[in-house]
């Protein structure tokens, strides 16, 4: 049976031009983490496996970094960038869980940060 | 195995800047952050900033924008860090930690930094 | 810059005792902390990642816990080679930062 579950940083939102750090924490379960997986609605952006460290997908090699963590940084912002987003934690031997953030590039200097939330 | 070779002490005078490097072996080397932390016994371990040499991106610790300059080559899997305007309080042990699916899991064995007057 | 507090500087213990070292962070940090030990003249092993999470080769006497804001490392029937300084570290947000530092002394 799958125990854990997933929280993110949930909604957020950053300014156009700026960085966000998109952060999910796997809790309430033992299950070893193979690999983490970020995506965007149906694009991978990066992976990062237990045995070979980070892969960044090549066409978003220059706007993201890996890190902190298991988090993504993403850079150079922009209102494309708006979206949902998805860590998948690959484990054994629960399986997958998946967690969702959206992301809001705003023009302005109005951007705040939402709550945190969790998804089972 | 991996494994990371730091370059040796430096005594330095004030004023001047000095370049350490880590030389990574045992592993992609382009496919982990490598970072850079300073510990004095004042002030504990602190985060310089890391590259991430699969595409040369940086991040630093404000504290040290403008002192600390981190660089990579790939051809030889070696980090470097610049450190410059040398001062006293630049006097520490630098390690090299590398970053990837576990935080810091494998350091250097430090280059101890000493700036004379 | 997130502070991560070890409020202990000293610790004194005997061999078989149990330990257990806290660190508290100013902000929540979910459970993206680690814990290191460190030797005189050596440089830090990494023993505990994502807060609860033993790496490879740890001895299991070695036990993260915690989430948020509070953490602790918890050493059982602690031995004469874990006489040593623990350092904490959040990697929940730039720039990373880490605890003072928990010296384990003998009584």
């Known amino acids: 049976m799958m125990t854990g579950t997933i929280e993110t940083t949930g909604n957020i939102s950053a300014e156009k031009g700026g960085s966000i750090i998109l952060q999910c924490h796997l809790s309430s379960t033992t299950a070893q983490v193979t690999q983490v997986n970020w995506e965007q609605q149906d694009q991978l952006l990066a992976i990062c496996n237990a045995d070979l460290g980070w892969h960044i997908s090549p066409s978003f090699k220059d706007r993201v970094a890996p890190g902190p963590g298991l988090g993504l940084t993403l850079q150079s912002l922009t209102v494309n960038d708006t979206g949902e987003y998805f860590c998948i934690y690959h484990t054994y031997p629960d399986g997958t869980y998946t967690g969702r953030i959206f992301l809001e590039v705003l023009e302005s200097s109005v951007a705040e940060h939402g709550a945190r939330f969790q998804i089972p | 195995q991996a494994y990371l070779q730091q370059s040796g002490a430096e005594l330095v005078r004030s004023g001047a800047s000095v370049k350490m490097s880590c030389k990574a072996s045992?592993?992609?080397?382009?496919?982990?952050?490598m970072h850079w932390v300073k510990q004095t016994p004042g002030q504990g371990l602190e985060w310089i900033g890391y590259?991430?040499?699969?595409?040369?991106?940086?991040n630093y610790n404000q504290k040290f924008k403008g002192k600390a300059t981190l660089t990579a080559d790939t051809s030889s899997n070696t980090a470097y860090m610049q450190i410059s305007s040398l001062t006293s309080e630049d006097s520490a042990v630098y390690f090299c930690?590398?970053?990837?699916?576990?935080?810091?899991?494998?350091w250097g064995q430090g280059t101890t930094l000493t700036v004379s007057s | 810059d997130i502070v991560m507090t070890q409020s202990q500087k000293f610790m004194s213990t005997s061999v078989g005792d149990r330990v257990s070292v806290t660190c508290k962070a100013s902000?929540?940090?979910?459970?993206?902390v680690a814990w290191y030990q460190q030797k005189p003249g050596q440089s830090p092993k990494v023993l505990i990642y994502?807060?609860?999470y033993r790496y490879s080769g740890v001895p299991d006497r070695f036990t993260g816990s915690g989430s948020g804001t509070d953490f602790t490392l918890t050493i059982s029937n602690v031995q004469s080679e874990d006489l040593a300084e623990y350092f904490c570290?959040?990697?929940?947000?730039?720039?990373?930062?880490f605890g003072a530092g928990t010296k384990l002394e003998l009584k």
């Open positions: 994502s807060a609860s």
């Open positions: 045992g592993y992609t080397f382009t496919s982990y952050n």
């Open positions: 570290q959040q990697y929940n947000s730039y720039p990373l930062t």
């Open positions: 590259i991430y040499p699969g595409n040369g991106g940086t």
């Open positions: 930690a590398r970053d990837g699916f576990y935080p810091f899991d494998y």
């Open positions: 902000q929540n940090v979910g459970t993206n």
